[in-house]
């Protein structure tokens, strides 16, 4: 969720933005997971070795660590500039963003970098804004922010109601979880009063780390090292390496080529989740990891030192064979999940296309007029119109309808940017499937 300042369409009426939620920042709750294949073990070791050199690029260093104080310039590649830069209006230069002030996450042709989000009171800064990544804000301990009410952090409940037991702790993105003692079914909805409660301090694990846990951890680490040494020394290495390259290039893509249309920085997938879970938390700088829900089942977006500003290309052949359907990553309601993303669309769709887009989506001129009048400011107009569209069309208001309308208007760039944004926000993921089985 990128908060635009410098290139916001208008200064007034700017809708409040939050930094990325937990899905964007950290992925699932911590906890050891067992690797499924030998390849993952090998990949873990490989990534462990390359993690330090690969993950920190010059743009991510604090100002005092960088060579030159002035804005760095380089030449655009195919009319685009790398993450951490924006393009000059004449298209001749890539100008670096200012550390701690603004950023850009993708290869882009932005005329200005995006302004860094400032965390609200009641939030802690999980990782600072660098030139390639926005600030990551998280609710303070004892509070959480739900997917469907992202405006503010709410206090976690201190315990479960009578007849229920706690099965999940308060996390920055979820309240405590309670289930009925007998049925084991989850409790949903607010509890009027906490009676017989089972309390625990917010954010603490349900059970402390036991001796057996430590033993398992040490054993797994030892096995990883032994297997890695064996693989490195054996001929198996030659067989495994191409497979790993396949994973890292998005399943067969050429790692030398850069995908300029579907990068999702920070959107590491399940494979990476598996790998990260093997590593000690300190071995990969946490703020650099940004593990997210899967966007696609392949494609580990780890950056090699030589191409630290580039992201690798997914298999083009696969893309052309099947229409990739966007579905909510958390199996939530598609229309509601889409609605949560509207806030950012004003930054992605050129202002001049707002009204044509809404007409294409079925809003009447008078409905557009009303939406404009209702909007808190220029900045909010598209948001208000999109909400009107959802209210009018209900379940038929699908992400694909929106993207198709942009395509029809010739706004392919905006369409791509929205698609990228939906994926990198962690709210949507690709479901490979046929066009006729399209889901919203």
């Amino acid at each position: 969720m990128e908060q635009r300042g410098q290139n916001a369409p208008a200064a007034s009426g700017a809708r409040k933005r939050h930094g990325p939620g937990p899905r964007e920042a950290r992925g699932a709750r911590p906890g050891p997971r067992v690797p499924k294949t030998l390849v993952l073990v090998v990949a873990a070791v490989l990534l462990l070795v390359s993690a330090e050199s690969a993950l920190i690029t010059q743009q991510d260093l604090a100002p005092q660590q960088r060579a030159a104080p002035q804005q760095k310039r380089s030449s655009p590649s195919e009319g685009l500039c790398p993450p951490g830069h924006h393009i000059s209006e004449d298209g001749r230069d890539c100008i670096s963003c200012k550390y701690g002030q603004d950023y850009s996450t993708h290869w882009n042709d932005l005329l200005f970098c995006l302004r860094c989000t400032r965390c609200d009171s009641g939030e802690v800064e999980l990782s600072p804004c660098t030139t390639t990544r926005n600030t990551v804000c998280q609710c303070e301990e004892g509070t959480f922010r739900e997917e469907d009410s992202p405006e503010m952090c709410r206090k976690c409940r201190t315990g479960c109601p009578r007849g229920m037991v706690k099965v999940g702790d308060c996390t920055p993105w979820s309240d405590i979880e309670c289930v009925h003692k007998e049925s084991g079914t989850k409790h949903s909805g607010e509890v009027p009063a906490v009676e017989e409660t089972v309390t625990s301090s917010p954010g603490t694990p349900a059970s402390p780390c036991s001796l057996s846990g430590i033993i398992i951890g040490v054993t797994v680490a030892a096995v990883v090292l032994i297997v890695a040494v064996f693989v490195c020394k054996s001929l198996l290495w030659k067989k495994v390496l191409p497979y790993l390259k396949g994973i890292c290039s998005g399943g067969g893509g050429d790692p030398e080529r850069v995908d300029r249309s579907s990068q999702r920085p920070g959107a590491e997938d399940n494979v990476l989740n598996e790998i990260v879970s093997i590593l000690q938390p300190t071995q990969v700088p946490e703020q650099e990891m940004e593990v997210q829900e899967p966007a696609e089942p392949t494609g580990v977006n780890m950056l090699s030192p030589g191409e630290s500003e580039h992201l690798l290309e997914p298999a083009e052949a696969e893309r052309s064979q099947r229409r990739r359907l966007l579905v909510p990553a958390n199996e939530g309601d598609p229309t509601e999940t889409l609605r949560q993303c509207f806030d950012d669309f004003a930054d992605l769709v050129p202002f001049d296309s707002w009204e044509p887009l809404m007409r294409k989506l079925g809003l009447m001129d008078n409905e557009i007029k009303v939406a404009k009048a209702e909007a808190a400011g220029h900045r909010d107009t598209l948001y208000t119109m999109l909400i009107k569209w959802v209210n009018k069309t209900g379940r038929d208001a699908s992400v694909h309808t929106l993207l198709d309308a942009l395509e029809t208007l010739g706004e392919r760039l905006a369409k791509q940017k929205i698609e990228d944004h939906l994926l990198s926000s962690g709210k949507f993921m690709y479901l490979e499937g046929n066009a006729d089985s399209a889901m919203s």
Epitope: Q6, N7, A10, A11, G79, F112, P350, L413
Partner: antibody, heavy 123, light 111 residues
């Protein structure tokens, strides 16, 4: 409402300098390049150059490189164009215009213009 | 520099008829799959007003009577039907390459 308010008409002597202002309101000043355009009496339009209000970076039409200096004052959301060594050839209406694009691929179009400043160079 | 030629300096059209104004560039103004050609209307004593951006996109608040077409080097602004209020000078402008340049203008008059 986006507005670009330019300074009033000016009558200056040859050889002198003049500074024309363009005060922006109704939008994020540092989020859009500002351009300057010259229109001599009864003639077409000529692009003078651009200024990036965020960092003061400039780009000029070679023809005006030694004639115009483009600057900005961020706190007051104002762009300035100073014209030096004035001659009668510099008598014209000068416009400031905002680039409405956010992405370069949007096409760099001038969506809002100031009302124009008439400059007369005469002894 | 890219030279823009508006071959018809003035054009007289009857009310309710179609007006077609052309603009030819000395080299392609296409980039990013878009044409960086824009059309402006200017009335006496007023600043230019954006009508069409990127060759064919109608600026917000401009009547649908105005339309733009073309790519690479040949572009057309069409006004259909022409109204009395359309009497003005029309300029094409390219922003694909520095220095940005304008056409010489086409003055539209009513027959």
């Amino acid at each position: 409402e986006v507005q670009l308010q330019q300074s009033g008409p000016d009558l200056v002597k040859p050889g002198a300098s003049v500074k024309i202002s363009c005060k922006a309101s109704g939008y994020s000043f540092t989020g859009h390049y500002m351009h300057w355009v010259k229109q001599s009496h009864g003639q077409s339009l000529e692009w003078i150059g651009r200024v990036n209000p965020n960092n003061g970076g400039t780009g000029y039409n070679q023809k005006f490189k030694d004639k115009a200096i483009l600057t900005v004052d961020k706190p007051s959301s104002t762009a300035y164009m100073e014209l030096r060594s004035l001659t009668s050839e510099d008598s014209a209406v000068y416009y400031c215009a905002r680039n409405g694009a956010y992405y370069r691929s949007d096409g760099n179009y001038f969506d809002y213009w100031g009302q124009g400043t008439t400059l007369t160079v005469s002894s | 520099d890219i030279v823009l030629t508006q071959s018809t300096p003035s054009l007289a059209v009857s009310l309710g008829q179609r007006a077609t104004i052309s603009c030819r560039a000395s080299e392609s103004v296409d980039s990013y799959g878009n044409s960086f050609m824009h059309w402006f209307q200017q009335k006496p004593g007023q600043p230019p007003k954006l009508l069409i951006y990127r060759a064919s996109n109608l600026e917000s608040g401009i009547p649908a009577r105005f339309s733009g077409s073309g790519s690479r080097t040949d572009f057309t602004l069409t006004i259909n039907p022409v109204e009395a209020d359309d009497v003005a000078t029309y300029y094409c402008q390219q922003s694909n390459e520095d220095p940005y340049t304008f056409g010489g203008g086409t003055k539209l008059e009513i027959k």
